[in-house]
């Protein structure tokens, strides 16, 4: 998740104009730059799988790609939790796992990913466009939620699922503490860099690049550290509200994954591609800083006709309280 900026090694400043204050102004931007680059923006991915042998059986897998510690995961369907969605499972890394029908088995797969088997049969089964959402509460990033569903065209007859549309809801106000400091630092850094454009550049060691190079690197796409495409408070409108399902036995057999990472992969991928890695491929790089969106590369994918934007009615502290996040 983290990339390190190659910070130019600064020569001691020349006496005179720069002086002690000048030295501080030169070192500070690089310290802040390193912090900004290494901080990384958390990402949430969701994969929804429908079993071929049991069309009413779904497996939802969710993961959190961030440096913070996860304090709670909530899996819901029918939309985000607290916005019309119904909680299927709550997973706390230390307090335990709780689930309610039709969820059959919720579990931690790793320290940052979970899976949930959802089962039913007959008319009470969830239909293909049911929305499943995973909300990760973490410190210090706050709460991040991704939602996804199997597209209606994902029948077992298809060899590859359609390219998924990404969805992410971020409780930006919940990003406190360290994130706030970093945000301030990054803004201050940009301010300093802008001011430095109008000054003569400091003397650098010849083997290093100019100050502009690390700045460009910091905002360039990379596999190791890409900020998430954040569509705040987004969910899918679905006309199909799942009914309570009867518990059924799990079935093996082939399956089709619809994966909903926080980054869009703008090319169709077959089941083999999804099976090879739990972390989906990532596309354009988008940074979000307190609701301001900057982008390098391509435009973010449009939300499409099935998406609506709305504020979280419960506010940034929605994940706190008796669920163990205090």
């Amino acid at each position: 998740m983290r990339t390190e900026a190659q910070v130019p090694a600064l020569q001691p400043p020349e006496p005179g104009l720069e002086g002690a204050m000048g030295h501080r102004t030169l070192v500070l931007p690089w310290v802040l730059l390193t912090l900004c680059v290494t901080a990384g923006t958390p990402e949430v991915w969701v994969q929804v799988r429908m079993e071929a042998t049991e069309l009413s059986s779904f497996t939802i897998r969710c993961g959190f790609l961030g440096s913070g510690s996860i304090s709670l995961v909530t899996v819901s369907w029918g939309g985000p939790n607290g916005a019309g969605g119904t909680t299927l499972a709550v997973l706390h890394p230390e307090r335990g796992i709780r689930q309610w029908a039709p969820a059959r088995q919720a579990r931690w797969e790793t320290q940052s990913s979970i899976s949930l088997i959802l089962e039913g049969s007959g008319a009470s089964s969830p239909c293909a466009n049911t929305t499943f959402c995973c909300k990760f509460a973490s410190f210090p990033e706050g709460s991040w939620e991704a939602c996804g569903s199997l597209p209606p065209s994902s029948d077992p007859g298809l060899s590859a699922p359609p390219t998924p549309a990404p969805i992410l809801r971020a409780d930006l106000a919940g990003i406190l503490g360290v994130s706030g400091v970093l945000l301030f630092g990054c803004v201050y850094l940009l301010h300093l860099l802008r001011r430095h454009k109008h000054r003569p550049a400091p003397r650098l060691q010849p083997s290093r690049t100019s100050p502009q190079a690390p700045r460009a690197r910091a905002w360039a796409p990379s596999q190791a550290s890409q900020a998430a495409l954040h569509v705040p408070y987004a969910t899918i409108n679905t006309s199909c509200r799942p009914a309570t399902l009867d518990t059924a036995h799990p079935h093996g057999g082939p399956s089709w994954w619809a994966s909903l990472p926080t980054h869009a992969a703008h090319r169709p991928q077959g089941p083999a591609a999804w099976a090879s890695t739990p972390i989906p491929a990532r596309g354009s790089f988008v940074s979000v800083e307190n609701g301001l969106y900057a982008q390098a590369g391509e435009r973010p994918p449009h939300t499409g006709p099935g998406l609506t934007l709305f504020p979280d009615p419960r506010g940034p502290r929605a994940m706190e309280g008796p669920l163990g996040v205090r």
Epitope: W100, T110, A318, G324
Partner: antibody, heavy 114, light 113 residues
Framework: EVQLQQSGPEVVKPGASVKISCKAS????????INWVKQSHGKSLEWIGD????????NYNQKFKGKATLTVDKSSGTAFMGLRSLTSEDSAVYYC???????WGQGTSLTVSS | DIVMTQSPSSLSVSAGEKVTMSCKSS????????????LAWYQQKPGQPPKLLIY???TRESGVPDRFTGSGSGTDFTLTISSVQAEDLAVYYC?????????FGGGTRLEIK
């Protein structure tokens, strides 16, 4: 801070039914998933079940299936536990607690006596 | 169901002494996915509801004095009170938080001499 306020003590006759309540306050009730726990006099604790306020979904300890019924009224922020066909074995203090048992109600004493 | 067995059933110590109590589960409470043990400890004082002390086998609930320490993994767990105070007079319960039904141990009654 979350507070769980339970209904008062009950004295009922054998064979009767009773419904005890647990009112949550201090936060959004839709975040509350309530557990119910039984403690017979001088004995240990037994988990009865839990309820999901989003849709009234429940999990029960097999031992209490048919004995306890858990319900919720989202509008008033109150969870209920009904107990039927009461016998002296059901005489106990019943507690409600939040999802991970980090907050508890004060307990409701139930005495079944003829 | 997972059976939780606590020992001793009661113990009497003087204020300032160190005390340990044991809890054994019939099945492992270790979650293989994240390597966490789903075991909780509660303190119940006379006439009061239980109070959560420890979760995840070793994490103290906020506000719990640091003289309370939980340890152990898998099926064997221990609650240690490093220096018993008069207000620690209570019954201590361990609980399986791993799988439903969430069973409790029989309790260890702590008395102060």
């Amino acid at each position: 801070e979350v507070q769980l306020q339970q209904s008062g003590p009950e004295v009922v006759k054998p064979g009767a039914s009773v419904k005890i309540s647990c009112k949550a306050s201090g936060n959004t009730f839709t975040d509350y998933f309530i557990n119910w726990v039984k403690q017979s006099h001088g004995k240990s604790l037994e988990w009865i079940g839990d309820i999901n306020p989003d849709n009234g979904g429940t999990n029960y300890n097999q031992k209490f299936k048919g004995k306890a019924t858990l319900t919720v009224d989202k509008s008033s922020g109150t969870a209920f536990m009904g107990l039927r066909s009461l016998t002296s074995e059901d005489s106990a203090v019943y507690y409600c607690a939040t999802l991970y048992f980090d907050y508890w109600g004060q307990g409701t004493s139930l005495t079944v006596s003829s | 169901d997972i059976v939780m067995t606590q020992s001793p059933s009661s113990l009497s110590v003087s204020a300032g002494e160190k005390v340990t109590m044991s809890c054994k589960s019939s099945q492992s409470l270790l979650n293989s996915g994240n390597q966490k043990n789903y075991l909780a400890w509660y303190q119940q004082k006379p006439g009061q509801p239980p109070k959560l002390l420890i979760y995840g086998a070793s994490t103290r609930e906020s506000g719990v004095p640091d003289r309370f320490t939980g340890s152990g993994s898998g099926t064997d767990f221990t609650l240690t009170i490093s220096s018993v105070q008069a207000e620690d007079l209570a019954v201590y319960y361990c609980q399986n938080a791993h799988s439903s039904p969430y069973t409790f141990g029989g309790g260890t009654r702590l008395e102060i001499k």
